[in-house]
Interface confidence: low
C-alpha cells in the first residue's frame, strides 16, 4: 500500500461511511441482529485528556491491537452468519465489506508504520496497560463499535501519524 | 553516545542564502526527527522548523515560511537547513537538536544539541 | 499561536531553593520541557515531561505542572547553576514548538 495513501482523508471517510451504513442497516432488524455469543471487542471511548498526555506509542498500540481485535470479531461474526439461518442474507454483505475494509485498513497502517511505533521503544509496551475492551453479542453493536473506532482512536492516530510525516 | 556536529561559522550579505549542515552520529539517524532552533544576540530560543528524516516532511514556523527549507540526507546521516533572503536581524547562533522518543509528538523533547553556528549578516 | 511567560530574572541566595514559573493557557494539557543554557553554550535538556530527569541531571532539578504554570525547582542551589532556563511545549494545534522567553537565574554572592 502506499505509505501516505490513509493520510488523505476521503480513504477514511469511505471505510468510516460503509462501517455507518452498516449500522444503520443492522439497528433495523429484530434485537439488533443477535450474534448468539459475546464476541470481545475494543472499547472505543477517548478520554481526549488522556490520550493527549499519553505516548504516541501508546496510541499507536490502541490502535494496531483494537484493529486486530475488531478484525478477529469481524471474522467470528462472518463465520457465526455463515452458519445462521435466521439472520438475512444482505447482512453478509455488509460484514464482508467490513472484513475487507479491516484488511485494508489494516496493510494501509502497517505502510505507515504504526505495528513498528507500537512496540518500539521496548518501556512504551511494559508500561501500557492492557487494551480495554468491551462485548457485542449484536450485529448492530459491533458495526456501532467498528464506525466508533474508526471516527475516533483510528482518526486520532492517522491525523497525528499524518500531520508529522511519520511513516 | 550521540553527537551532533554543525558546521563551521559563515558572514554573508544581505539578500543571500545561507545552508547549516548536522551531521548526526551515535544512534539510528532515521529514527528521530531534527529540529533547528535560532538564537539572535541576547536573546531567547526561537524554534525554526524541523524534519523527520524517515519520510522527508519537514515543518516550518510560520514566521520562517517561504524563507527557510530543511533537508536530510539519510546516506550521510546529515540535516541541512538553509536560510533565504538573509537581513541583518537573522544574525544569530543556529543550533540543530534531535528529537527523542516520538519525533513531532507531545511526547518528543529535545534531547541532544549540536553546538551552534554563528552566522552573521552583515553588508 | 501558543504563549509560554516566564519571568525575565529570578535570584537566589547559595543554598536556598529557586523557583522558575512558565505559564500558559490550560498549560497541564502539555507537557512541559526544561532546558539551562550557559553563556556561550548550547541548551542542555534538564527536566522533560512536566517531571522527569534526564540521566546526569541532579536530583535537585525538579518540575510540576499544575493549574496554569509549570514550574522548574532546584533545591540547594550552587553558583554553577547560574544560567537561562526555558520551558518548551509541543502546541499539537499548530504542531509546533514553541518557547517560553527564558528566565535568567542569578546566584547572589
Known amino acids: 500500500a502506499p505509505a501516505r495513501l490513509i493520510c488523505d482523508s476521503r480513504v477514511l471517510e469511505r471505510y468510516i461511511l460503509e462501517a455507518k451504513e452498516a449500522e444503520n442497516v443492522t439497528m433495523g432488524c429484530a434485537e439488533g441482529c443477535s450474534l448468539g455469543e459475546n464476541i470481545t471487542v475494543p472499547d472505543t471511548k477517548v478520554n481526549f485528556h488522556h490520550w493527549k498526555k499519553s505516548e504516541a506509542g501508546r496510541h499507536a498500540v490502541e490502535v494496531w491491537q483494537g484493529l486486530a481485535l475488531l478484525s478477529e470479531a469481524m471474522l467470528r461474526s462472518q463465520a457465526l452468519l455463515a452458519n445462521s439461518s435466521q439472520l438475512p442474507e444482505t447482512l453478509q454483505v455488509h460484514v464482508d465489506k467490513a472484513v475487507s475494509g479491516l484488511r485494508s485498513l489494516t496493510s494501509l497502517l502497517r505502510a505507515l508504520g504504526v505495528q513498528k511505533e507500537a512496540v518500539s521503544p521496548p518501556e512504551a509496551a511494559s508500561s501500557a496497560a492492557p487494551l480495554r475492551t468491551v462485548a457485542a453479542d449484536t450485529l448492530c453493536k459491533l458495526f456501532r463499535i467498528y464506525s466508533n473506532f474508526l471516527r475516533g482512536k483510528l482518526k486520532l492516530y492517522t491525523g497525528e501519524a499524518c500531520r508529522r510525516g511519520d511513516r | 553516545q550521540v553527537q551532533l556536529v554543525q558546521s563551521g561559522a559563515e558572514v554573508k550579505k544581505p539578500g543571500s542564502s545561507v545552508k547549516v549542515s548536522c551531521k548526526a552520529s551515535?544512534?539510528?539517524?532515521?529514527?528521530?526527527?531534527i529540529s533547528w532552533v535560532r538564537q539572535a544576540p541576547g536573546q531567547g530560543l526561537e524554534w525554526m522548523g524541523g524534519?523527520?528524516?524517515?519520510?522527508?516532511?519537514?515543518d516550518y514556523a510560520q514566521k520562517f515560511q517561504g524563507r527557510v527549507t530543511i533537508t536530510a540526507d539519510e546516506s550521510t546521516s546529515t540535516a541541512y537547513m538553509e536560510l533565504s533572503s538573509l537581513r541583518s536581524e537573522d544574525t544569530a547562533v543556529y543550533y540543530c537538536?534531535?528529537?527523542?522518543?516520538?519525533?513531532?509528538?507531545?511526547?518528543?523533547?529535545?534531547?541532544?544539541w549540536g553546538r551552534g553556528t554563528l552566522v552573521t549578516v552583515s553588508s | 499561536s501558543y504563549v509560554l511567560t516566564q519571568p525575565p530574572s529570578v535570584s537566589v541566595a547559595p543554598g536556598k531553593t529557586a523557583r522558575i514559573t512558565c505559564s500558559g493557557d490550560?498549560?497541564?494539557?502539555?507537557?512541559v520541557h526544561w532546558y539551562q543554557q550557559k553563556p556561550g553554550q548550547a541548551p542542555v535538556l534538564v527536566i522533560y515531561?512536566?517531571?522527569e530527569r534526564p540521566s546526569g541531571i541532579p536530583e535537585r532539578f525538579s518540575g510540576s505542572n499544575s493549574g496554569n504554570t509549570a514550574t522548574l525547582t532546584i533545591s540547594r542551589v550552587e553558583a554553577g547553576d547560574e544560567a537561562d532556563y526555558y520551558c518548551?511545549?509541543?502546541?499539537?494545534?499548530?504542531?509546533?514548538?514553541?518557547f517560553g522567553g527564558g528566565t535568567k537565574l542569578t546566584v547572589l554572592g
Open positions: 515531561r512536566d517531571n
Open positions: 551515535g544512534g539510528t539517524f532515521r529514527s528521530y526527527a
Open positions: 490550560n498549560i497541564p494539557e502539555y507537557y
Open positions: 518548551q511545549v509541543f502546541d499539537e494545534s499548530s504542531w509546533h514548538w514553541v
Open positions: 537538536a534531535r528529537e527523542l522518543y516520538y519525533p513531532g509528538t507531545w511526547m518528543a523533547v529535545m534531547a541532544y
Open positions: 524534519i523527520d528524516p524517515i519520510s522527508g516532511f519537514a
